[in-house]
C-alpha cells in the first residue's frame, strides 16, 4: 500500500517516499517509481542550510558597506554570509541588517562594557569615590585622587563628574 509517512530525510509526494536534497543542493525533480530525486548544487552566491525540497537556493546575505556592514564570515553553499559592523558601529537588531554608532557614556557615567560589532556600549553611573568628566565610549569611571598618599589634603570634594582637588596642608607655625 502507498506510504502515509516517510523516513527521516525523505518526503512524501505522489504516494512515493522521495529523498530530500542534502544541504547545499536544491531540488530539480521529485523521485518517481523508476528514478531517484534529482538535486543540483547551489550556485556561488547561494545556499541551503537544511535537508530540503526547495526548487530555489537562498541568496547569500549582502553586507552593505553603506549601512556600515562588513563580512565577518563568507557564506558557503550550506551557510549564509555572516555580517558584522565596521569599527565604532554595532548592529541595530539581531538580524544585523544595519549599523549605528556606539553610544558614548556622558560625564558622570563610565563604560561598564565596551561595545562590540553586535552590542552597544553599556554605561553605569559612577559610584561615590569615582568620576568621569568626559563623554566617551571607552573610558571607565576613574577613582578620585587620593590626596593623603600625596601628603595633600582635599580642598574641593569630588563628584561623579569631577575629581577631588588636593592642596597643601595648612602648617601650624
Amino acid at each position: 500500500e502507498p506510504p502515509t509517512a516517510c523516513r527521516e530525510k525523505q518526503y512524501l509526494i505522489n504516494s512515493q517516499c522521495c529523498s530530500l536534497c542534502q544541504p547545499g543542493q536544491k531540488l530539480v525533480s521529485d523521485c518517481t517509481e523508476f528514478t531517484e530525486t534529482e538535486c543540483l548544487p547551489c550556485s556561488e552566491s547561494e545556499f541551503l542550510d537544511t535537508w530540503n525540497r526547495e526548487t530555489r537556493c537562498h541568496q547569500h546575505k549582502y553586507c552593505d558597506p553603506n549601512l556600515g556592514l562588513r563580512v565577518q564570515q563568507k557564506g558557503t553553499s550550506e551557510t549564509d554570509t555572516i555580517c558584522t559592523c565596521e569599527e565604532g558601529l554595532h548592529c541595530m537588531s539581531e538580524s544585523c541588517e544595519s549599523c549605528v554608532p556606539h553610544r558614548s557614556c556622558l560625564p558622570g557615567f563610565g563604560v561598564k562594557q565596551i561595545a562590540t560589532g553586535v552590542s552597544d556600549t553599556i554605561c553605569e553611573p559612577c559610584p561615590v569615590g569615582f568620576f568621569s568628566n568626559v563623554s566617551s565610549a571607552f573610558e571607565k569611571c576613574r577613582p578620585w585622587t587620593s590626596c593623603e598618599t600625596k601628603d595633600l589634603v582635599v580642598q574641593q570634594a569630588g563628584t561623579n563628574k569631577t575629581d577631588v582637588v588636593c592642596g597643601p596642608q595648612d602648617r601650624q607655625r
Epitope: 529523498s19 525533480s29 517509481e33 523508476f34 528514478t35 531517484e36
Partner: antibody, heavy 112, light 112 residues
Framework: QVQLQESGPGLVKPSDTLSLTCAVS?????????WNWIRQPPGKGLEWMGY???????NYNPSLKNRITISVDTSKNQFSLKLSSVTAVDTAVYYC?????WGQGTLVTVSS | DVVLTQSPLSLPVTLGQPASISCRSS???????????LNWFQQRPGQSPRLLIY???NRFSGVPDRFSGSGSGTDFTLKISRVEAEDVGVYYC?????????FGQGTKLEIK
C-alpha cells in the same frame, strides 16, 4: 489519465531511417519522468532502446550504436525516435512508454 | 550490461494455485541510496506490457493484491497467490538501476 500514442510508417526500406512519434496526453513531458522507446521483435522479448528525460537529456542502448536519436517537441508534448540504417532485424513492434504507462505499440516492418 | 535471467521460461499453472517466477541479476541492483529499481510487467496476448510491481515490492495502482514482489540485491521473485484465467501472458522483470536498462527474457504463464 496519462496516455501515449505511437504514430509513423508501418513499412520502411532497408538502409532507410525509421521515424516514429509518441504523442503524450494527460501529463507534460517536461515535468518529470524518463520517456522511453522499447521494441519487441515478433514472438520475442522486450528490448529497451533509450530514453529522453524531462530536461531533454538522453541515454541510449549501446547495442544500437550510433543509429538511434530520441528528441522531444515540447510545444506538441511529444517525443520521437529515429533509427538509421535499418535492416530486417529491426522489424518489431515499437512501444513508447513512461514505464508505468505504455502506448499500444506500432508494428514496423523493414522490407524492400 | 546487467543480465537478468528469469526462470522458469514456461510456467503451466492450475487455476487457483500459486505461481512463482524468479529473476536473477548479474550484479546488484541496489544503488548508493539503498533503492533497488527492479520492476515486474505483465504482457497479455496481443497487448502492451503493464506495470505490476515497481522497486521490488510496491504494487502499482489498480494491480490486484494477489500479485506480490520480493527480493534484494541480485535475487528477486514475483508471486501470484491464486492464479486466475486473466493472468495468462508473459511476465518480464526490468531493471532501471543501471544504464542500459535491461529486461529478463520473459516467463510464459499458461493454464494447465
Amino acid at each position: 489519465q496519462v496516455q501515449l500514442q505511437e504514430s509513423g510508417p508501418g513499412l520502411v526500406k532497408p538502409s532507410d531511417t525509421l521515424s516514429l512519434t509518441c504523442a503524450v496526453s494527460g501529463y507534460s513531458i517536461t515535468t518529470n519522468y524518463y520517456w522511453n522507446w522499447i521494441r519487441q521483435p515478433p514472438g520475442k522479448g522486450l528490448e529497451w532502446m533509450g530514453y529522453i528525460k524531462y530536461d531533454g537529456s538522453n541515454n541510449y542502448n549501446p547495442s544500437l550504436k550510433n543509429r538511434i536519436t530520441i528528441s522531444v517537441d515540447t510545444s506538441k508534448n511529444q517525443f520521437s525516435l529515429k533509427l538509421s540504417s535499418v535492416t530486417a532485424v529491426d522489424t518489431a513492434v515499437y512501444y513508447c512508454a513512461r514505464l508505468d504507462y505504455w502506448g499500444q505499440g506500432t508494428l514496423v516492418t523493414v522490407s524492400s | 550490461d546487467v543480465v537478468l535471467t528469469q526462470s522458469p521460461l514456461s510456467l503451466p499453472v492450475t487455476l487457483g494455485q500459486p505461481a512463482s517466477i524468479s529473476c536473477r541479476s548479474s550484479q546488484s541492483l541496489e544503488n548508493s541510496n539503498g533503492n533497488t529499481f527492479l520492476n515486474w510487467f505483465q504482457q497479455r496476448p496481443g497487448q502492451s506490457p503493464r506495470l505490476l510491481i515497481y522497486k521490488v515490492s510496491n504494487r502499482f495502482s489498480g494491480v490486484p493484491d494477489r500479485f506480490s514482489g520480493s527480493g534484494s540485491g541480485t535475487d528477486f521473485t514475483l508471486k501470484i497467490s491464486r492464479v486466475e484465467a486473466e493472468d495468462v501472458g508473459v511476465y518480464y522483470c526490468l531493471q532501471v538501476t543501471h544504464v542500459p536498462f535491461t529486461f529478463g527474457q520473459g516467463t510464459k504463464l499458461e493454464i494447465k
